[in-house]
Amino acid sequence: SGTTNTVAAYNLTWKSTNFKTILEWEPKPVNQVYTVQISTKSGDWKSKCFYTTDTECDLTDEIVKDVKQTYLARVFSYPAGNVESTGSAGEPLYENSPEFTPYLETNLGQPTIQSFEQVGTKVNVTVEDERTLVRRNNTFLSLRDVFGKDLIYTLYYWKSSSSGKKTAKTNTNEFLIDVDKGENYCFSVQAVIPSRTVNRKSTDSPVECMGQEKGEFRE
């Protein structure tokens, strides 16, 4: 029997943000091709990214079918069809991914402050409810639709003239905070899922300050 230089994939890594989910692996192929398969614990294996020379595979379409399921993927290595490679029958080389539960593990994307409105000494700050690729009844669900009250937002706000930050929390997408009249404030928000053990927090949103476009002021 002959030999082949086919090598198994390694460093299989899930990269997932707001349920957009890509499996990455190494190495770059030389005289070989890959096929990815994905399954739930109780389901059948489904081939994706078939016969590819890429080292990443977008598995979003599969995981959004049920984001609370736990998924396993495996990457098969095959000798390319133009490679001289003959040996006795043998299963293709493959490597398993770590298990991945989207609901518990997808990273929370950087949130965006949609608007803020001042009325007297109160400011209403609204966080954009980001659309995900999770569908229900043919419509895409928002992050809030998917996570419900599991998702909270933390607001950091401070006077433009000072560095002392205050915080507020909400389990909706809106904050109503007290401010000093005549002062300009800056705002940043962070998405948080307190019940999680990993990937609990997003990165902070871009800072928005009063006196700029997104704001509105009423006496």
Epitope: T35, F50, G81, E84, S85, T86, E91
Partner: nanobody
Framework: QVQLVESGGGLVQPGGSLRLSCTAS????????MGWHRQAPGKGLELVAV???????HYADFVKGRFTISRDNAKNAVYLQMNFLRAEDTAVYYC????????WGQGTMVTVSS
Amino acid sequence: QVQLVESGGGLVQPGGSLRLSCTASETISSTYIMGWHRQAPGKGLELVAVISGDGVTHYADFVKGRFTISRDNAKNAVYLQMNFLRAEDTAVYYCYAAGRWNHWGQGTMVTVSS
């Protein structure tokens, strides 16, 4: 060693059809890729089409819309339906199964000529 036996080749006129069949001598795992490559006179081996155990397919650009690959896991067989054949499809067509290694049939000749 897995033995692959092809059949169905022959002489056909341009625009005609042929169906190639390939059967393995032993059970082929559903994790194997099966498919077809071809080698035209004086040219190198090139991929035609491949299929996974669960029916996912990949075609070379030059056959898309003309050729259809299918697989019967129970029969350890793979098929290639070739329609709208052209003179440039003339080649030896090799059945292929890939697991840990590549396995090849002996080839079947397809000649497209008027």
